[in-house]
């Protein structure tokens, strides 16, 4: 009895998580991604905001830019030119959409310790970057691209047709930024900076979404965004390349679109430079099951780019859409023509293939009933990639090295046994030539970042181990987490269950399902998190479960493509199936089951609540999609086809939340949305609310004025407080 008494006295000094802990970010963790500038050097911003250069081989470090210089222009970010002569300092950050923002840029000359005066950059700039060699600058201002040979030089204007909401040069429009690239930029330097490729997006014919931004003026202003919803007119994209050494000579040269792509509506999906005179473009039909990778060469005599049909590689899916969430990008080998790429093998698992001449003759590099997820780096003798192969847990990520210089190629798991209990979910960041790399472990234990030798894989040092977090958590009663699977009708449903600290299987607990469930997503991951649901388990004694059903990723095409053209059916069914299985486990109070989700999760939670099963007492939808006709073309059509009679209109109509308004009568429903949501428009919730009112169904709602899809800032605190009250009331938990 004695040890358990000691144990109990220890537990008495420990406390549960509070909502305040979560809202204050008390238990947030840090990661360390080196800003690599060579094979053995990286930059990092120190705790006191100096920019420090570290040399791994000499062990030396020195400040290249003082916090005083940073502070003098209120800089929040920086970028060193490859020749190390200049640094750009970024200030006045102003967020636009998910990745895009504008900022003011100052150029600091490291050789004389002064800011560059004369020919200063205009403001605000939409995107700015150094060339890969030297100190040329490319930037986008008012939707046009400019070039500077050196920071103090006058600029050369490359494009002139840029116009707000009409023509975008070098930056994507809304839908390309969110759903296709997905980046804030659409320009790419060639490896030595000789050429600059860029995309031009023409949005002139795209319908505009307009919503009010209330601000604090007498009259609200209207935000207008060209936003193609499913079936609407799409942006027209063109790709140009300009010689930056002599840009006025022939001007921008358009890269031809493959004939089989250009015959109907299409997308540009990515651009990869191979050499200074070879470029690889990826294109996609609007019906996103055919992708073409086109390798183009510079023709010196004509000063044009030639994309021979023999260098077109087609990737097609017959069971779903091309790729996973996006079509994968090629990683070229040193011969500058062959490449490595992830796509589905004959068994329907995404694996690395080596393409030398044609896709048909591709050599499969990895195989098995698991998936290769990302190719990090290809060197002369090694290929580094991540996968979820180890111990058959789809929600893990380990880093592997395949030797490609020897035959047969040998495979080594670099991370599998490093810190096995603590670390099962890794990403990596490689220096030039993979001389060194950083591993960032996200969990399931406290995250840790380490530096490694690229040849021996030996750990050199710990970059960040979150010691303060570890100490802070010592007296916190964290919930228990388990990742397991259910086998139901030949479908494997992986789930994560978050259990109260003193969980007792013989007792009954309220259950909250947290769902996302979107195509090619994964919620059940072996990662560390102290968040709202951790608090609900720790303090409020709830059991929380996350389930990856049909449509989710990294478990093969059968599961992934099951939802093709049928969104809103199997994702919901699988959540319901899992809940029934959880009830069978004996520790769930079946009268106190709730479901909540955000975005796609809000759609699934709404449909689950309206499924008529009687399983759910209550639920919350935050910023839900309510009809696929309201969402972006690129995303929606990838999975649903077109909302036309001769395509898939019927399922578009059948899969709306509004069509199930009657079924909300017997559940408590909390509907939440930001009025300035540029992504999932407020329209979605407005239509749900209208349908519920028309059906005379009672429900609760909360809007967040002028908030976007992220509901950030003070709204976050209000949101989670409000949802907590709602759930506690639903579960009859005292405040």
């Amino acid at each position: 009895l004695r040890p358990s008494r000691v144990h109990n006295s220890e537990e008495n000094t420990m406390r549960a998580l509070t909502l305040k802990d979560i809202l204050n970010g008390t238990f947030s963790y840090k990661t360390f991604f080196p800003n690599w500038i060579s094979g053995q050097e990286y930059l990092h911003q120190s705790a006191d905001n100096n920019i420090v250069l570290y040399n791994i081989e000499t062990g030396q470090s020195y400040t290249i830019l003082s916090n005083r210089t940073m502070k003098s222009v209120n800089a929040s970010n920086y970028g060193l030119s490859p020749d190390r002569q200049f640094v750009y300092l970024e200030s006045d950050y102003s967020k636009l959409w998910r990745y895009s923002y504008t900022a003011t840029y100052y150029i600091y000359d490291l050789s004389n310790g002064e800011f560059v005066r004369g020919n200063e950059l205009p403001r605000p700039i939409q995107y700015l970057c150094w060339s890969p060699v030297g100190s040329k600058l490319a930037y986008v201002y008012q939707n046009n691209i400019y070039l500077k040979q050196r920071p103090g030089d006058p600029p050369f204007q490359i494009t002139f047709n840029g116009r707000e909401n009409k023509i975008f040069n070098g930056i994507p429009d809304w839908v390309y930024e969110e759903e296709m690239l997905p980046t804030k930029y659409a320009l790419w330097w060639s490896p030595n900076g000789k050429f600059l490729a860029y995309a031009e997006f023409n949005d002139k014919d795209i319908p505009v979404i307009a919503y009010s931004y209330y601000g604090d003026e007498q009259y609200p202003r209207t935000i207008n965004i060209p936003y193609p919803k499913a079936g609407a007119k799409n942006p027209v994209v063109r790709i140009f390349i300009i010689d930056t050494t002599y840009p006025a000579y022939v001007g921008p040269q358009e890269v031809p679109v493959p004939a089989m792509i250009a015959s109907s509506d299409y997308y540009f999906s990515w651009l990869t430079w191979v050499t200074d005179e070879r470029v690889c473009l990826q294109w996609l039909k609007r019906v996103q099951n055919v992708s073409v990778l086109s390798i183009c060469d510079f023709r010196e005599d004509w000063q044009t780019w030639d994309c021979p049909k023999t260098q077109e590689h087609i990737e097609e899916s017959r069971t779903g859409w091309a790729g996973g969430f996006f079509v994968s990008r090629p990683v070229f080998s040193y011969d500058a023509i062959s490449y490595y790429k992830i796509f589905s093998d004959k068994d329907g698992y995404k694996h690395i293939h080596y393409i030398k001449d044609t896709v048909e003759n591709a050599i499969q590099i990895t195989s098995g009933k698991w998936e290769a997820i990302n190719i990090f780096r290809v060197t002369q003798d090694s290929l580094f990639y991540s996968s979820n192969e180890f111990e058959e847990y789809p929600g893990r990520r380990n880093i592997y090295r395949i030797s490609i210089g020897s035959y047969p190629p040998s495979k080594k798991c670099v991370t599998c046994h490093l810190r096995k209990e603590r670390c099962q979910y890794y990403t990596a960041s490689f220096s030039d030539y993979a001389k060194y790399y950083a591993l960032v472990c996200y969990g399931p234990g406290i995250p840790i970042s380490t530096l490694h030798d690229g040849r021996t894989d030996q750990e050199i040092k710990i970059l960040e181990e979150n010691k303060e977090l570890e100490n802070a958590l010592k007296n916190i009663q964290l919930p228990k987490e388990e990742i397991k699977k259910l086998e139901v009708d030949e479908i494997t449903l992986w789930y994560k269950m978050i259990l109260p600290p003193q969980f007792d299987r013989s007792k009954k607990y309220p259950l909250l399902i947290q769902v996302y469930g979107g195509p090619c997503s994964q919620s059940v991951r072996s990662v560390f998190a102290v968040n709202w649901i951790s608090y609900l388990a720790s303090k409020e004694g709830m059991v929380i479960a996350l389930v990856d059903g049909r449509g989710t990723a990294f478990q093969g095409d059968k599961l992934l493509y099951a939802v093709y053209r049928k969104l809103g059916v199997y994702e919901v069914e699988d959540q319901i199936t899992a809940v029934r299985k959880f009830i069978e486990m004996g520790f769930i109070d079946e009268k106190r089951i709730a479901i909540w989700g955000w975005s796609y999760g809000g759609y699934v939670s709404s449909l689950a609540l309206a499924s008529g099963t009687g399983l759910f007492k209550c639920g919350i939808a935050v910023a839900p999609v309510s009809s696929w006709e309201y969402y972006a073309s690129v995303y929606t059509e990838r999975f649903m086809g077109l909302p036309t009679k001769d395509d898939n209109l019927e399922h578009y109509k059948n899969s709306t939340v509004m069509a199930r308004a009657e079924y909300f009568r017997n559940v408590d429903y909390l509907l939440i949305h930001g009025t300035a949501d540029d992504n999932v428009h407020f329209q979605n919730s407005a239509q749900i609310a209208k349908a519920l009112v028309n059906a005379q169904v009672d429900f609760q709602a909360m809007w967040y004025s002028d908030q976007n899809h992220g509901l950030s800032g003070l709204s976050t605190n209000h949101l989670y407080t409000h949802m907590t009250h709602f759930l506690k009331q639903c579960f009859s938990l005292s405040d």
Partner: antibody, heavy 118, light 108 residues
Framework: EVQLLESGGGLVQPGGSLRLSCAAS????????MSWVRQAPGKGLEWVSA????????YYADSVKGRFTISRDNSKNTLYLQMNSLRAEDTAVYYC???????????WGQGTLVTVSS | EIVLTQSPGTLSLSPGERATLSCRAS???????LAWYQQKPGQAPRLLIY???SRATGIPDRFSGSGSGTDFTLTISRLEPEDFAVYYC?????????FGHGTKLEIK
């Protein structure tokens, strides 16, 4: 301060050759394209030839193509123009200039006079 | 090649007056790729304007450029004694780059 100093001009007979040099200072020479522009006595300006910063690309006016060769030595910060098969109409002041983007010229050297006459 | 015609050939004005110099192209100059230079006797040309309207570093704001397509203008808002010189326009929107024959601005 950017400085460009031409040299090598002089009197030469038709059919003869001459090599002009332009010594550059005050800027990162290898980062910029450079050009030669000429001005016949009492006449306007005519672009003659250009070369990229690395020296990898060269460009010529039709009137001198095949006769003139532009080159540079980035280690010496010097630009050259080799002029062969000279004609009377090549008589001009030859200026070297920093060439921005294959567009405008700024600054210019003070020029060197080439006279082709028998 | 694009031929640039400058007018007038000679412009006689007094200090303090406004000068308007014209440059017309035989075909459209793409993207307003046009520059203006000033040349004084015995000196090398000096860049005034690039991109049709952007003033070069150190050029006083009394010099301004405008125009697009085939018609371009250099304006000197208030002539100073040192502004009397020959002015050349130059296009770089198409190869080869070409210059106009110049406008001589002389003191009246």
């Amino acid at each position: 301060e950017v400085q460009l100093l031409e040299s090598g001009g002089g009197l030469v007979q038709p059919g003869g050759s001459l090599r002009l040099s332009c010594a550059a200072s005050g800027f990162t020479f290898s980062s910029y394209a450079m050009s030669w522009v000429r001005q016949a006595p009492g006449k306007g300006l005519e672009w003659v030839s250009a070369i990229s910063g690395s020296g990898g690309s060269t460009y010529y006016a039709d009137s001198v193509k095949g006769r003139f060769t532009i080159s540079r030595d980035n280690s010496k910060n010097t630009l050259y123009l080799q002029m062969n098969s000279l004609r009377a109409e090549d008589t001009a002041v030859y200026y070297c200039a920093k060439d921005y983007y294959g567009g405008w010229f700024d600054p210019w050297g003070q020029g060197t006079l080439v006279t082709v006459s028998s | 090649e694009i031929v640039l015609t400058q007018s007038p050939g000679t412009l006689s004005l007094s200090p303090g007056e406004r000068a308007t110099l014209s440059c017309r192209a035989s075909q459209s100059v793409s993207s307003s790729y046009l520059a203006w230079y000033q040349q004084k006797p015995g000196q090398a040309p000096r860049l005034l304007i690039y991109g049709a309207s952007s003033r070069a570093t150190g050029i006083p704001d009394r010099f301004s450029g405008s125009g697009s397509g085939t018609d371009f203008t250099l304006t000197i808002s208030r002539l100073e004694p040192e502004d009397f010189a020959v002015y050349y326009c130059q296009q770089y929107g198409s190869s080869p780059r070409t210059f106009g024959h110049g406008t001589k601005l002389e003191i009246k």
